[in-house]
């Protein structure tokens, strides 16, 4: 008779990241007997849901079930059937849904109700859908990258395989950029966190961490662009907006109703004498940069130091992992290398933005024009946010590591969220010494 392989003693977990621009499903796997060890959970699958973020379904909620089907069916295939019922599924919605909730609590609940009903029909252990706070988003992103970098273990097991020259057990700060919000999270050095709203205390694996975090709602790359357009159209002399953040020769028609749909543009709302306006790209990095800086109010700070809009920010400390759209945009622009200085990044951005739109379209024929057209803005916005918003300098720029994945797992809040909800990060160091990584991979 044929020998039957013993079933793997592993567990699985699913987290759906319901972002402002799209939803992604992540499947995690870990050895069942090592739940409390550091660094044992890893991502086995990412499935990007086709379509926009869930907040866009507010007028067509009956389509949500179909929207989620492909990725949920993928999860059914990846996870052994015998483990479906014990696999938890969590859905966390971020700033896109925070904005919808600001407009209407009922509309947000309507979307989440249908999301929950749809997900509960799958054979997994569905644990609900919720809008996570900006503070949670920042904190879980910080936990994810430090967990994956081995920063919480007594003796880092990743030292030989993590491609970052890091200062031993000092944690990395986390910089997360989404479509509708951006988060900055790090452990400041011997600095009191002057604003209680920005202070988090964790005890992880026997060590205390005093963490600073802030989420800037409306300062994700997509909402920042809407803000900039709303600000600039206020002072336009007619319905043609010459925009330095788009390539020369680029043209696009924008509906004023779309511009004012989001709560993020309310402060710039003005009765305009037209229903549409036309963007004409001029491709000028410096002017684009200056226009973006007008979104950051730096004239008021009730603390010793602020980022912008009167939000406390302690002096930057240590290395930072910049992920999500920070990574995707910089990767597209080929600017993620550790060797590229801030000056070089600025120089490359100037060249990129100045390239004619027709030339850009030819060079990147496989990229959707909607996305392609916005890289000049997004790249300039990232520089503006990091340098003027968060006060990175040419020197401290070298401490920013643009990270997509760490050991095959995406950097982002989802892993930290799952580790927390499944109680897999103990407050105290487990008694047994974790095996070396090679023992169980």
């Amino acid at each position: 008779t044929q020998n039957k392989a013993l079933p793997e003693n592993v567990k699985y977990g699913i987290v759906l990241d319901a972002g402002s621009s799209h939803t992604s499903l992540y499947i995690y796997k870990w050895p069942a007997e090592k739940e409390n060890d550091t660094g044992v959970v890893h991502q086995v699958e990412e499935c990007r849901v086709k379509g926009p973020g869930i907040s866009k379904f507010v007028q067509k909620v009956n389509e949500i079930g179909i929207y989620l089907t492909d990725c949920m069916e993928r999860a059914r295939e990846v996870i052994p059937r015998s483990q479906h019922q014990e696999t938890p599924v969590y859905l966390g919605a971020t700033a896109g849904m925070r904005l919808l909730r600001m407009e209407s609590e009922e509309l947000a609940d309507r979307v989440l109700d249908v999301v929950e009903r749809s997900l509960s029909n799958y054979p997994f252990d569905f644990q609900g859908a919720r809008i996570i706070t900006g503070q949670e988003e920042g904190a879980y992103g910080w936990i994810t990258i430090n967990y994956l970098l081995g920063k919480f273990s007594q003796k880092t097991r990743w030292f030989s395989i993590v491609p970052y020259e890091t200062n031993n057990q000092e944690t990395f700060g986390a910089l997360d950029l989404g479509g509708a919000s951006t988060q900055v999270t790090f452990v400041p050095q011997n600095q009191t966190i002057e604003s209680p709203d920005n202070a988090l205390q964790f005890r992880l694996y026997g060590k205390d961490y005093n963490v600073y975090t802030h989420s800037f709602l409306c300062y994700g790359k997509d909402q920042a662009l809407w803000q900039k357009l709303a600000k600039d159209i206020q002072v336009a002399s007619n319905e043609i907006l010459r925009d330095p953040c788009f390539h020369p020769g680029y043209k696009k028609v924008v509906n004023v109703s779309d511009l004012y749909k989001t709560p993020c543009t309310k402060r710039f709302e003005k009765k305009l004498p037209f229903d549409q306006f036309r963007i004409q790209g001029t491709g000028d990095y410096e002017q684009c940069h200056q226009s973006i800086l007008e979104l950051f109010n730096t004239s008021y700070c009730p603390y010793s130091q602020c980022a912008f809009n009167g939000i406390f920010l302690p002096p930057l400390q240590g290395d930072f992992g910049a992920f999500s759209a920070f990574y995707f945009v910089m990767k597209f622009l080929n600017l993620t290398s550790e060797k590229v200085s801030q000056e070089k990044v600025t120089e490359m951005m100037k060249k990129f933005c100045a390239q004619p739109w027709e030339e850009i379209k030819t060079s990147y024929a496989g990229v959707k024009e909607k996305y392609l057209s916005e890289y000049c803005f997004s790249g300039t916005y990232i520089l503006s946010l990091l340098l003027q918003g968060y006060h990175f300098t040419a020197d401290s720029w070298e401490h920013i590591h643009f990270i997509g994945k760490i050991q095959g797992s995406d950097a982002g809040w989802t892993l930290g969220y799952m580790l927390n909800l499944t109680n897999m990060i103990p407050a105290e160091q487990p008694l047994s010494t974790p095996l070396s990584h090679s023992t169980y991979v």
Epitope: V61, N62, L112, S120
Partner: antibody, heavy 121, light 107 residues
Framework: QVQLVQSGAEVKKPGSSVKVSCKAS????????ISWVRQAPGQGLEWMGS????????NYAQKFQGRVTITADESTSTAYMELSSLRSEDTAVYYC??????????????WGQGTMVTVSS | EIVMTQSPATLSVSPGERATLSCRAS??????LAWYQQKPGQAPRLLIY???TRASGIPARFSGSGSGTEFTLTISSLQSEDFAVYYC?????????FGGGTKVEIK
């Protein structure tokens, strides 16, 4: 004041199907979920599934997946529960109940009078 | 799924006395908990929702308390019409789940 009126008692053969109706009157039908709950003789309450008539979206307890279908007709303010491949263990009183708290609030505030379904050969 | 456990299964109380019924959830349900009363041959009736809010028309002698995993229904002074079966139900997550019930009978 919302009222739910269910169809009459049914006697069915094993292997057949039953379809129970639940007509709402005196309030908004579409926006609130309608749940179906059954109770076997001398037993407790068991949730089977739910639908939001406004969207036609139904969800079901894993135990009944593939065997139960819940639908709603907004024009007549009526919800339906069809259970197929009946067996003797399905003998129970079937209740419809309105989820009276709005979206994401699934407390069951208004109940139908119940429909006795007997499965016997 | 969330398992709801009620205790005791049967509670014998004299009219006018206080009755305390317990309900435990296998994981936190916050305050998403309801209590129902069911009399023989009748449909259940909602008494309490949100763990502690009385449904309309429910007498003040019925009160609910608790949050997370431990909940209590208290009937301060039992009337003859209160002898019935009481069920708790969580509505935080699908599937909606009920406790096994507590039968309150005349002592």
């Amino acid at each position: 004041q919302v009222q739910l009126v269910q169809s009459g008692a049914e006697v069915k053969k094993p292997g057949s199907s039953v379809k129970v109706s639940c007509k709402a009157s005196g309030g908004t039908f579409s926006k609130y979920g309608i749940s179906w709950v059954r109770q076997a003789p001398g037993q407790g309450l068991e949730w089977m599934g739910s639908i939001i008539p406004e969207f036609g979206i139904a969800n079901y307890a894993q135990k009944f997946q593939g065997r139960v279908t819940i639908t709603a007709d907004e024009s007549t303010s009526t919800a339906y529960m069809e259970l197929s491949s009946l067996r003797s263990e399905d003998t129970a009183v079937y209740y419809c109940a309105r989820e009276s708290g709005g979206y994401r609030d699934h407390r069951l505030g208004v109940w139908g009078q119940g429909t006795m379904v007997t499965v016997s050969s | 799924e969330i398992v709801m456990t009620q205790s005791p299964a049967t509670l014998s109380v004299s009219p006018g006395e206080r009755a305390t019924l317990s309900c435990r959830a296998s994981q936190s349900v916050g305050s998403n908990l309801a209590w129902y009363q069911q009399k023989p041959g009748q449909a259940p009736r909602l008494l309490i929702y949100g763990a502690s809010t009385r449904a309309s028309g429910i007498p003040a002698r019925f009160s609910g308390s608790g949050s997370g995993t431990e909940f209590t229904l208290t009937i301060s002074s039992l009337q003859s019409e209160d002898f019935a079966v009481y069920y708790c139900q969580q509505y935080l997550l699908w599937p909606l789940t009920f406790g096994g019930g507590t039968k309150v009978e005349i002592k």
